[in-house]
């Protein structure tokens, strides 16, 4: 028994005075606790505890289940213990077959012995199967067998505690080890859609998928910059061992504009945390915003092609699209398609393909689009650049030579005089009158210019050239005339195309 110096409280003394006691099944257990301040006896085995306020603990007919630790405690809280084995050849093990272990931790197979003198106390696999090679264990007859550093691979391992008794192997009832995995990575989180656009009153529902090795992963939906608890529903599945999936669905049955914002799905485990966000935008009504991809004023050369391209945002989805010119709707030559195949796409593209445009095809081309809430339109002003065309070239009764040319941009008319038989007209002649005339065609058609010179200024035979030109090209007309005496005769106008 322990000894202490006088004056200090001492632990109780127990008779018999040994740490371990072996009795046979059916025999009496008699334990005496001697202490002036005796309080109680406590019995413990597995998770069982019993108390006795008598200083003598007597069990008349011992059973295997009386195997365990008997502790006497005094009023100072000091104690002394004795471990009693009740040897029962028919019941070598006391068991609690609950067996859960955490990965990388030790776990106890609870099969304490009723007889410490049996040999080869160890673990064995069920049905003669060998234990995993790396499984290490430490037997303790009073507690059971400690499996060291549980591995994930031991999950659902079936085993027995085993002893040799009189040369024969005796097995306990079977134990099945359930291994709780350690978190060795953060949870994997994903969201059904990264952004949502809704009209007021529509239902907002978003699902977060959380994947981890076990169901003890924590997850929640949070509104950024808000502490409000959100209503969410869960579904979960175990896809085999160590592959757990949870779906957390957040729903707002009737979304309002002020519900707009960023929602975060947050998950954490003992290793760390992960999150993913989704953005909700709630609008009071739908919208359409059109963005021209080219300038809305377009200049194109005669005979060339041009594509009128718009991008537009439409929510809800566009229902009607059309391209119009001169109050006529195009039935072909255009295409309309979503900018992306993404489910949440609200951006679209419309293209009108104008081919081999003629000078008469300038004008306003309008794209119209509508959805269930709004209409929108955008206009392109198309100008067709045409080289000048000389419409008339005449000698008027008043002696004027007049040249009228049409084209776009507005042509410039220059006059030249070529004396005699020279081929090149270089001497320029100033016009008497220049006017831009109103065209009778559409407002985006060719511009008509009229220019006149006084033929009386010419005193010699020769040729007068009227040259009309713009950025696209040039065209000339010629007046040939000769003098007969004092009179100009034989004026023969003719044109010469100059590219």
């Amino acid at each position: 028994q322990p000894s202490v110096s006088p004056g200090e409280p001492s632990p109780p003394s127990i008779h018999p005075g040994k740490s371990d006691l072996i009795v046979r099944v059916g025999d009496e257990i008699r334990l005496l606790c001697t202490d002036p301040g005796f309080v109680k006896w406590t019995f413990e085995i597995l998770d069982e505890t019993n108390e006795n306020k008598q200083n003598e603990w007597i069990t008349e007919k011992a059973e295997a289940t009386n195997t365990g630790k008997y502790t006497c405690t005094n009023k100072h809280g000091l104690s002394n213990s004795i471990y009693v084995f009740v040897r029962d050849p028919a019941k070598l093990f006391l068991v609690d077959r609950s067996l859960y272990g955490k990965e990388d931790n030790d776990t106890l197979v609870r099969c304490p012995l009723t007889d410490p003198e049996v040999t080869n106390y160890s673990l064995k696999g069920c049905q003669g199967k060998p234990l995993p090679k790396d499984l290490r264990f430490i037997p303790d007859p009073k507690a059971g067998i400690m499996i060291k550093s549980v591995k994930r691979a031991y999950h659902r391992l079936c085993l027995h505690c085993s002893v040799d008794q009189e040369g024969k192997s005796v097995l306990s009832e079977k134990f099945i080890l359930k291994v709780r995995p350690a978190f060795k990575a953060v949870p994997v989180v994903s969201v059904s859609k990264a952004s949502y656009l809704l009209r007021e009153g529509e239902e907002f529902t978003v699902t977060c998928t959380i994947k981890d090795v076990s169901s003890s992963v924590y997850s929640t939906w949070k509104r950024e910059n808000s502490q409000t608890k959100l209503q969410e529903k869960y579904n979960s599945w175990h896809h085999g061992d160590f592959n757990y999936e949870r779906q957390a669905t957040l729903t707002i049955s009737s979304a309002r504009v002020n519900d707009s914002g960023v929602f975060m799905c947050y998950a954490n485990n003992t290793f760390g945390s992960a999150n993913v966000t989704t953005t909700l935008e709630v609008v009071d009504k739908g919208f359409i915003n059109i963005f021209p991809m080219i300038n809305t004023t377009v200049f194109v050369n005669d005979g060339e092609n041009v594509d009128l391209i718009v991008e537009y945002e439409a929510f809800p989805k566009p229902e009607h699209q059309q391209w119009i010119y001169m109050n006529r709707t195009f039935t072909d030559k255009w295409e309309d398609y979503p900018k992306s195949e993404n489910e949440s796409n609200i951006r679209y593209v419309s293209e009108l393909h104008l081919t081999r445009l003629k000078g008469t095809e300038g004008g306003t081309y309008t794209f119209l689009v509508s959805n269930s809430d709004v209409n929108a339109a955008i206009a392109f002003n198309v100008y067709v650049n045409t080289k000048p065309e000389i419409l008339t070239y005449d000698r008027l009764v008043n002696g004027m030579l007049q040249c009228v040319a049409a084209g776009f941009p507005e042509p410039t008319i220059d006059w030249y005089f070529c004396p005699g038989t020279e081929q090149r007209c270089s001497a320029s002649v100033l016009p008497v009158d220049v006017q831009t005339l109103n065209s009778s065609g559409p407002p985006f058609g060719k511009l008509v210019v009229q220019s006149s010179i006084d033929s009386s200024a010419f005193k010699h035979n020769g040729t007068v050239e009227c040259k009309a030109y713009n950025d696209v090209g040039k065209t000339s007309a010629y007046f040939n005339f000769a003098f007969k005496g004092n009179n100009k005769e034989q004026i023969h106008p003719h044109t010469l195309f100059t590219p």
Epitope: L46, E48, V95, D96, S98, Y100, S214, S215, S216
Partner: nanobody, 123 residues
């Protein structure tokens, strides 16, 4: 064949009481610490209470402490759960199961679990 058969569930008003029983066959329950677990509609499995092999040690979830009492009769191979002061949030299917994991996680489940008995607490 091992069977755990729960009984005693039913409809009860808030504040009322029920006693659940779990009778085992094909299995000696004295070799297991035993647990009661429950599953509320749309929720995961939640541990409620556990009892040691001989019945002297009992364990409870915070949500039921002071209201529920677990007990066992190894001679009858039966586990019990006395439920008092019942609340709407106690509505669930209650299962008895073999084993007790002090972490409360029960990863990998139980060696054996019953089919459950429905407890509905409603006025």
């Amino acid at each position: 064949e091992v069977q755990l058969l729960e009984s005693g569930g039913g409809l009860v008003q808030p504040g009322g009481s029920l006693r659940l029983s779990c009778a085992a066959s094909g299995l000696t329950i004295s070799t297991y610490a035993m647990s009661w677990v429950r599953q509320a509609p749309g929720k995961g499995l939640e541990w409620v209470s556990a009892i040691s092999t001989g019945g002297s040690s009992t364990y409870y979830a915070d949500s039921v402490k002071g209201r529920f009492t677990i007990s066992r009769d190894n001679s009858k191979n039966t586990l019990y759960l006395q439920m008092n002061s019942l609340r709407a949030e106690d509505t669930a299917v209650y299962y008895c199961a073999t084993g007790y994991d002090s972490s409360g996680h029960y990863y990998g489940g139980f060696d054996y679990r019953g089919q459950g008995t429905l407890v509905t607490v409603s006025s």
